[in-house]
């Protein structure tokens, strides 16, 4: 591309030239693709509301848990087991939590009357000892409840454990009570207040509308908009048993999904509630199943600070609010339409694929000869020729050769390395169809030439008898009219080419060669056709006529302009033309690659 461009270069437009194929089959395929794609595009546009600009929800949550539980605790007092009844209200079983979560206690283990002193550890694999050597002063085991003193002391009976400085007596390692102490928490209810906002659409709403009956309880089908949930129902929805989860605790997700259509003509913005168990119910004992934590109630007794340690098991409810609000937006619509336009090109891609496949050499040589029902597909070869123009990379080694006794043209795209061009096999290329309109440009003398005496009037391209081989003819010559090349030895092999592959009459003996290539009258006409006011001296005229004759031969024998550019003239034709239009002095330069 040129470095600088003129103003006219800016104001121009390029477009593709297309081939229109009148075909019932391909027309049907095209419309089938277009209808399917159009239907899908329209369906997706409407069903996914792709004409809307969507914005994520911003939300705040507030919860209130209600319910009373009666707890029957078994305690040991002076070695005697006693059953104690106590009532737990909201303040007893709920704990303040950050974020969109609330916690309900369902079970607990109490260690009462703890104070800071020295005492033996609770017996476990890690704390049992047989001598002081099994304990280490200052050692703090992650699983321990205190700092070891280095002494091994009696815990109970003949059990000895390491002594620790800790809150004593040490909390016992025991299982959570079964059934859960607050099993009746199943009947507790929670009110969820959820305010949401779509600032980009300037829209705010909440899950509790003014006319709501506050005595309702959520039900998936009968009351799906009620914001009051029974804890047992939440677990039933996820397929879990509240009583089982209550023993060890767990984590439950309450999902509030807002899918809001904020368009005036289809306005809808109500929440959908769903539930999901979030903790791992399959965890084994060693990986701490459920959900628990410890908290302590501190008090003073006889001026000694004491505490009651409570290991709390319960259910943490995480409220997960998500969703989007969408409103019609012309830009989104245009972007969507733009992004789907390319799908309409699928028909062209598919049809081009069919044409390319059915016109391949593989189909021509392996499928069509054997498969009769595939025969109609041969038409694709015609479509392919009309659609595609194949060009070969114009390498310096590219050459085309045409033998008069062969129907095809040979393409030689390799270095000759001293071999005669006559002997190089090359690749067979079909001869382009003759465009007879070009002949209309030739002078009338060529069309209406009177018959030559002694020659019959029917078409007679070559004389039947072979020209006897002259003693001067090179070994590669098959027509007897070729002459050795005058080029240096390195370039000589390029001109070592005959007009024939097998022995026979020379093309230069044909009447048409004389009329098309050697006729001064025709060549002058062609030169003037290109340059009407051409006036040349004798030497220049000969040179112009000679090169015009070369071109005429190449166009005649090779047909295609591209092939003619790389055509190598046979030695016999080259020397016959040179004889007719000689160079006054110096050597002939021979073939030069145009690129």
């Amino acid at each position: 591309m040129p470095a600088c461009c003129s103003c006219s270069d800016v104001f121009q437009y390029e477009t593709n030239k297309v081939t229109r194929i009148q075909s019932m089959n391909y027309g049907t395929i095209k419309w089938f693709f277009h209808v399917i794609i159009f239907s899908y595009v329209c369906f997706a546009l409407v069903s996914d509301k792709l004409y809307q600009r969507k914005e994520p929800v911003i939300s705040s949550v507030h919860t209130k848990v209600k319910g009373i539980a009666e707890v029957k605790e078994e305690i040991v007092e002076n070695g005697v087991k006693k059953l104690v009844h106590s009532v737990f209200d909201t303040a007893d079983y709920t704990f303040p939590l950050q974020g969109n979560s609330f916690f309900v206690m369902t079970n607990f283990l109490k260690t009462e009357g703890q104070e800071q002193r020295l005492c033996p550890e609770y017996p476990t694999r890690r704390t049992l000892c047989s001598s002081d050597r099994g304990c280490k002063k200052g050692w703090m085991d992650p699983q321990s409840k205190g700092i070891q003193t280095g002494r091994c002391v009696v815990y109970e009976g003949n059990q000895k454990t390491c002594e620790v400085s800790a809150w004593c007596p040490i909390e016992a390692v025991e299982e959570a009570p079964r059934p859960a102490l607050l099993n009746s928490a199943e009947n507790f209810t929670v009110l969820i207040k959820n305010n949401i906002d779509f600032p980009g659409h300037n829209y705010t709403t909440r899950n509790i509308l003014p006319g709501l009956n506050i005595t309702c309880t959520f039900h998936k089908t009968q009351n799906p908009q009620c914001p009051i949930f029974r804890l047992g129902d939440i677990f039933r929805e996820t397929g879990d048993n509240f009583s089982d989860v209550a023993i060890q605790g767990g984590i439950m997700g309450i999902e509030i999904y807002w899918d809001c259509n904020l368009d005036r003509w289809f306005h809808h913005c109500r929440p959908k509630y769903s539930f999901r168990r979030l903790d791992d119910k399959t965890t084994n004992v060693s990986l701490y199943p459920g959900y628990n934590f410890r908290y302590a109630k501190y008090y003073k007794e006889n001026n000694v600070e004491k505490r009651t340690l409570i290991k709390v098991f319960g259910i943490r409810f995480d409220i997960l609010v998500f969703g989007t609000g969408g409103k019609f937006d012309i830009i989104q619509l245009v972007v969507y339409i733009g992004s789907t336009l390319s799908y309409f090109g699928l028909a062209a891609v598919f049809i081009d694929f069919l044409i390319d496949t059915y016109s391949s050499n593989c189909c021509r040589s392996h499928i069509y000869p054997w498969c009769k029902c595939c025969q109609p597909c041969v038409v694709n070869e015609y479509y392919y020729r009309k659609k595609c123009e194949s060009i070969v990379e114009p390498k310096p080694t590219l050459k085309y050769v045409s033998f008069v006794d062969e129907s095809h043209i040979r393409m030689v795209n390799q270095q000759l390395l001293g071999r005669s061009l006559q002997d190089v096999k090359g690749q067979e290329v079909p001869r382009p169809a003759m465009d007879f309109t070009d002949l209309s440009r030739l002078p009338l003398a060529l069309h209406d030439t009177p018959p030559i005496p002694g020659q019959p009037e029917e078409i007679q391209l070559l004389r039947k008898e072979a020209t006897p081989r002259s003693r001067d003819s090179p070994v590669w010559c098959q027509c007897g009219s070729c002459l050795p090349s005058q080029l240096p030895e390195s370039h000589r092999c390029l001109e070592e080419l005959c007009c024939r592959k097998k022995p026979g009459a020379c093309i230069t003996t044909s009447e048409l060669f004389r009329k098309l290539v050697l006729s001064r009258h025709v060549l002058q006409f062609l030169l003037l056709y290109q340059e009407p006011l051409l006036a040349l001296d004798v030497d220049s005229t000969n040179s112009r006529l000679r090169h015009c004759a070369y071109r005429c031969y190449a166009t005649w024998r090779f047909g295609s302009q591209d092939m003619a550019d790389f055509a190598i003239l046979p030695s016999c034709c080259r020397w016959r033309i040179r004889k007719e239009f000689p160079k006054s002095e110096g050597q002939y330069s021979g073939f030069k690659s145009p690129y």
Partner: nanobody
Framework: EVQLVESGGGVVQPGGSLRLSCAAS????????MGWFRQAPGKEREFVAA???????DYGDSVKGRFTISRDDAKNTVPLQMNSLKPEDTAVYYC???????????????????????WGQGTLVTVKS
């Protein structure tokens, strides 16, 4: 779950050597601390030697310098090489395993029999002239 099988016990003369071997089943063998204990007739079970999952060792006072414990995690075995044997080394020798998956056994606790969850059936070693 780990199964332990001891082998290599027998009768040996004082000053002689013997090599006991403990073969463990289970793919997680490398996560276990392994120990050897012995129990002479009418006596309490006594610690002999132990090796943690990361290779640290501990020996009972009466065997230090004479016995050597090692482990081969590829073969799931724990050999105990016993040299300069004495008549007082006569006992049933037990192999034991302590799970260290959730936390290593502290070195000072390797000798405690309470740390070991899994025990073998034992192999008898008799030292007499």
């Amino acid at each position: 779950e780990v199964q332990l099988v001891e082998s290599g016990g027998g009768v040996v003369q004082p000053g002689g050597s013997l090599r006991l071997s403990c073969a463990a089943s289970g793919r997680t063998f490398r996560h276990y601390a392994m120990g050897w204990f012995r129990q002479a007739p009418g006596k309490e079970r006594e610690f002999v030697a132990a090796i943690s999952s990361y290779g640290s060792t501990d020996y009972g006072d009466s065997v230090k310098g004479r016995f050597t414990i090692s482990r081969d995690d590829a073969k799931n075995t724990v050999p105990l090489q016993m040299n300069s044997l004495k008549p007082e080394d006569t006992a049933v020798y037990y192999c034991a395993a302590a799970d260290e998956t959730l936390g290593a056994v502290p070195n000072f606790r390797l000798h405690e029999k309470y740390e070991y969850e899994y025990w073998g059936q034992g192999t008898l070693v008799t030292v007499k002239s």
